[in-house]
């Protein structure tokens, strides 16, 4: 079948999800496409525990996640509710800063060097993290 029962080569399994950590940079939309071509999505952080796991693997490097407000409200790429979900913004962020001189504000979220989140210009070539969930069907215990 099409069930994903284990993580692909070079991906890291954690809490029934698979994660892939880039070592090169792309703009947010290009990173999003990269993940999609892997049948995955940019990482969606749903807990402090997941935050610490991702932070441990990326180190102190700006890294895209699957959170943006390019169409108005902040949205996670997999549909996870933003308002009620986990957040870890830096103080006074997101600020949609226009002072960078690159045109427009800041519509894409990334992990900063201390792991907390910031909104930034989506065209910046940051590293990124892809995530894909192991299928629920594969979580069923085997029949004895």
């Amino acid at each position: 079948g099409s069930e994903r029962t284990c993580c692909p080569v070079n991906w890291v399994e954690h809490e029934r999800s698979c994660y892939w950590f880039s070592r090169s940079g792309k703009a947010w939309a290009d990173a999003d496409n990269y993940c999609r071509l892997e049948d995955a999505h940019l990482v969606v952080v749903t807990s402090w525990e997941e935050q610490k796991f991702v932070q441990h693997h990326i180190g102190p490097v700006n890294t895209w996640m699957g959170l943006h407000d390019q169409n108005g409200p902040w949205k996670w790429v997999d549909g996870t509710d933003y308002e009620t979900g986990f957040k870890n913004w830096r103080p006074e962020q997101p600020d949609d800063w226009y002072g960078h001189g690159l045109g427009g504000g800041e519509d894409c979220a990334h992990f900063t060097d201390d792991g907390r989140w910031n909104d930034d210009v989506c065209q910046r070539p940051y590293r990124w993290v892809c995530e894909t969930e192991l299928d629920k069907a594969s979580q069923e215990p085997p029949l004895l």
């Epitope: 099409s2 994903r4 692909p8 090169s24 940079g25 792309k26 703009a27 939309a29 290009d30 496409n33 990269y34 993940c35 999609r36 071509l37 892997e38 049948d39 070539p125």
Partner: antibody, heavy 118, light 107 residues
């Protein structure tokens, strides 16, 4: 040994349709993105379309968007390209290629010629 | 779309020559670049990926370098089997795009 074998090319009138197939062997087909790349006679290479390993995501060049559809049947290790509303400028050799999300094409088929002419 | 421009469009060289061909991207693509070799009537063959990584089985006389917008493919000592057309390809952004090709001919 990785092998990719295209079929389905031929002569078709403008406005017509054609479906190309690419039979794959020698690797775990469902684990890799696949792509179509074309080359008009005497011209350079043009990326046409890509599809993720499990078929959940597809990507197209603007020149074929809305006319071509890429799909795959992992149970048959086969990649497809359904081409509708064909135009003279679609005349080319069509290659299927094993790729990945990084976009490098490490294995190619031998190509199949599509000629669109009245 | 990102435009890829190769130069020269053709080059005449002799066996044993050191030859360099270049590829320029219309915007920065970090190291998301590949090089292919194509011979008449045949499918392209991957030589270099990630700007400078040699594909398995490709002779070490081929090397790639560059990042950002400017890239080069170098033949340290041209061999008879190397006379072909070479294409660069960017995979930084969709649509993935190729250069127009550089034909390496026998002098």
């Amino acid at each position: 040994e990785v092998q990719l074998l295209e079929s389905g090319g031929g002569l078709v009138q403008p406005g017509g349709s054609l479906r190309l197939s690419c039979a794959a062997s020698g690797f775990t087909f469902s684990s890799y993105a696949m792509s179509w790349v074309r080359q008009a006679p005497g011209k350079g290479l043009e990326w046409v379309s890509s599809i993720s390993g499990r078929g959940g995501s597809t990507f197209y060049a603007d020149s074929v968007k809305g006319r071509f559809t890429v799909s795959r049947d992992n149970s048959k290790n086969t990649l497809y390209l359904q081409m509708n509303s064909l135009r003279a400028e679609d005349t080319a050799v069509y290659y299927c290629a094993k790729s990945n999300s990084s976009g490098w094409f490490d294995y190619w088929g031998q190509g199949t010629l599509v000629t669109v002419s009245s | 779309d990102i435009q890829m421009t190769q130069s020269p469009s053709s080059v005449s060289a002799s066996v044993g020559d050191r030859v360099t061909i270049t590829c320029r991207a219309s915007q920065g693509i970090t190291d998301w670049l590949a090089w292919y070799q194509q011979k008449p009537g045949k499918a392209p063959k991957l030589l270099i990926y990630a700007a400078s990584s040699l594909q398995s089985g490709v002779p070490s006389r081929f090397s790639g370098s560059g990042s950002g917008t400017d890239f080069t493919l170098t033949f340290s000592s041209l061999q008879p089997d190397d006379f072909a057309t070479y294409y660069c390809q960017q995979t930084n952004s969709f649509p993935w795009t190729f250069g127009q090709g550089t034909k390496v001919e026998i002098k």
